[in-house]
């Protein structure tokens, strides 16, 4: 099409743009390491960083771990996408009593309406079943017929929901006299260590949350308690701790009540790109410990790559590659220790501190 020629010409000589014949227009060329968010990007904002699998690009342009839905009571609602976390919700037959960022900190089974009550609104992943009296105008929970009134929207009797494991409290599903009062959980027998991640214990105004200890009279020294594998973030929200379940990660610090689990690359590897509380990309430590490894025939011409060897294996690497750079693999149990007097290199475990002294000790 001759009329397209001027548009194509405008792209020539401009290294930041290229001409896309399919859409017949100039497109912005994303810089190395960034990927287009659409077929023909027009500006730098149409390019994005690419995160590792199971990570997404958050609002601050950081690669952040997607939440996991691995708990038995959760299912995946939306998958982990390039710009949004995986979203988990309670599995069918349960509802969320304590929400968390992109997930649910505590799921309860939907209530079963007791005798004399029928389902007004079925339970969803977010809400419990709502029950109403079977015959309008008469509530089976009335103390006597003369005290009965039409239940208002906020006072529909509802069975006490049952929490799923790991919260092991039992619950009564029968309404008690008084119409709107719910049966109390038989939780008084249950105890909890002060910093245990379990959230059962003394009844709390907010399901799924409990104070660290019984609050002293007139004291505000109580805190929200999140479910296992969640922590209380700075904004006071229960947030999923990152997962270290990738093969190349190990746990550095555990998930605590007020801080996320942190992950690091397993021994013998190094973090090439970080992520919040974790490492988005681990690579084998690329420089071999000197004089401790052999040079196999098939690695003489290999360039450095970022592919990790299978777990439990670390191929030999070339301590003096032809290209002047280090190969990708290393022995995880070797570290560089320089003895300036003897010019020796001694193998030591990775976990041991590297002390460099003139005596080599």
């Amino acid at each position: 099409f001759p009329q397209d020629r001027p548009f194509e010409d405008t792209c020539h000589g401009n290294p930041s743009h290229y001409y896309d014949k399919a859409v017949r227009r100039c497109c912005y060329r994303c810089p190395m390491g960034l990927f287009p968010t659409q077929q023909c990007p027009q500006r730098p904002t149409d390019c994005r960083k690419q995160c590792e699998p199971d990570y997404y690009l958050d609002e601050a342009d950081r690669c952040t771990a997607c939440v996991t839905c691995s708990r038995d009571d959760l299912v995946e609602k939306t998958p982990c996408a390039w710009n949004s976390s995986r979203v988990c919700e309670c599995r069918p037959g349960m509802f969320c009593s304590t929400s968390a960022v992109n997930s649910c900190a505590r799921c309860f089974f939907h209530s079963v309406c007791p005798a004399g009550m029928i389902v007004k609104f079925p339970g969803t992943a977010q809400k419990n079943t709502v029950c109403e009296p079977a015959s309008p105008g008469v509530s089976p929970a009335c103390a006597s017929p003369e005290n009965c009134k039409e239940p208002s929207s906020g006072t529909i009797p509802q069975a006490k929901p049952t929490p799923v494991s790991p919260a092991t409290s039992s619950a009564s599903t029968m309404p008690v006299r008084g119409g709107t009062r719910l049966a109390q959980e038989a939780a008084s027998k249950l105890t909890r260590a002060p910093d245990s991640p379990s959230s059962v214990g003394r009844p709390s105004s907010d399901p799924g949350l409990s104070p660290t200890q019984p609050c002293p009279e007139g004291s505000g020294d109580c805190r929200k308690q999140c479910e296992p594998d969640y922590y209380l973030d700075e904004a006071g929200r229960c947030t999923a701790c990152v997962s270290c379940s990738r093969d190349d990660l190990v746990e550095k610090t555990p998930c605590a009540w007020n801080s996320s689990r942190t992950c690091e690359c397993r021994p013998g590897m190094i973090c090439a790109t970080s992520a919040t509380n974790s490492c988005a990309r681990c690579v084998p430590y690329p420089i071999c410990a000197a004089e401790t490894v052999t040079k196999p025939q098939d690695m003489a011409e290999k360039d450095t790559t970022f592919e990790a060897p299978p777990l439990g294996t670390q191929p030999d690497c070339n301590p003096t590659p032809e290209n002047g750079e280090a190969p990708a693999s290393t022995s995880p149990t070797q570290s560089l220790l320089v003895d300036s007097q003897a010019s020796k290199t001694l193998p030591i475990p990775t976990s041991a501190p590297v002390a460099l002294s003139s005596t080599g000790k």
Epitope: C265, C271, T273, C279, L356, S357
Partner: nanobody, 122 residues
């Protein structure tokens, strides 16, 4: 205690060059492996290059052929010569000691020194 001071950053046009330095103290003798990491605004901490105590080097793919890492053990100084700079090299650059041990987690930016800012822009 290990202390690192990075310097040499600045504003440079695409295609230009800079030489970063990292003055180290607290090491004995030749010191351990050393690394350069960088962190672009709002992004993660990224490995750039490593040099071993005996001078063997490693570079991440995006800087190969453009950056050169070196060290002067007598002066306890680490260097990063950056040529053919690109806008995507814009970041705060940090040096890190003994990356084999210290850089397994995503925390090798800003733990030892304040870093030096490199801005590549026309």
């Amino acid at each position: 205690e290990v202390q690192l001071v990075e310097s040499g950053g600045g504003l440079v046009q695409p295609g230009g060059s800079l030489r970063l330095s990292c003055a180290a103290s607290g090491f004995t003798d030749d010191g351990p492996d050393m690394a350069w990491y960088r962190q672009a605004p709002g992004k993660g901490c990224e490995l750039v290059s490593i040099i071993s105590a005996d001078g063997r080097t490693y570079y991440t793919d995006s800087v190969k052929g453009r950056f050169t890492i070196s060290r002067d053990n007598a002066k306890n100084t680490l260097y990063l010569q950056m040529n053919s700079l690109r806008p995507e090299d814009t970041a705060v650059y940090y040096c890190a000691p003994d990356p084999r041990r210290n850089c397994r987690g995503g925390d090798c930016c800003g733990n030892w020194g304040q870093g030096t800012t490199v801005t590549v822009s026309s």
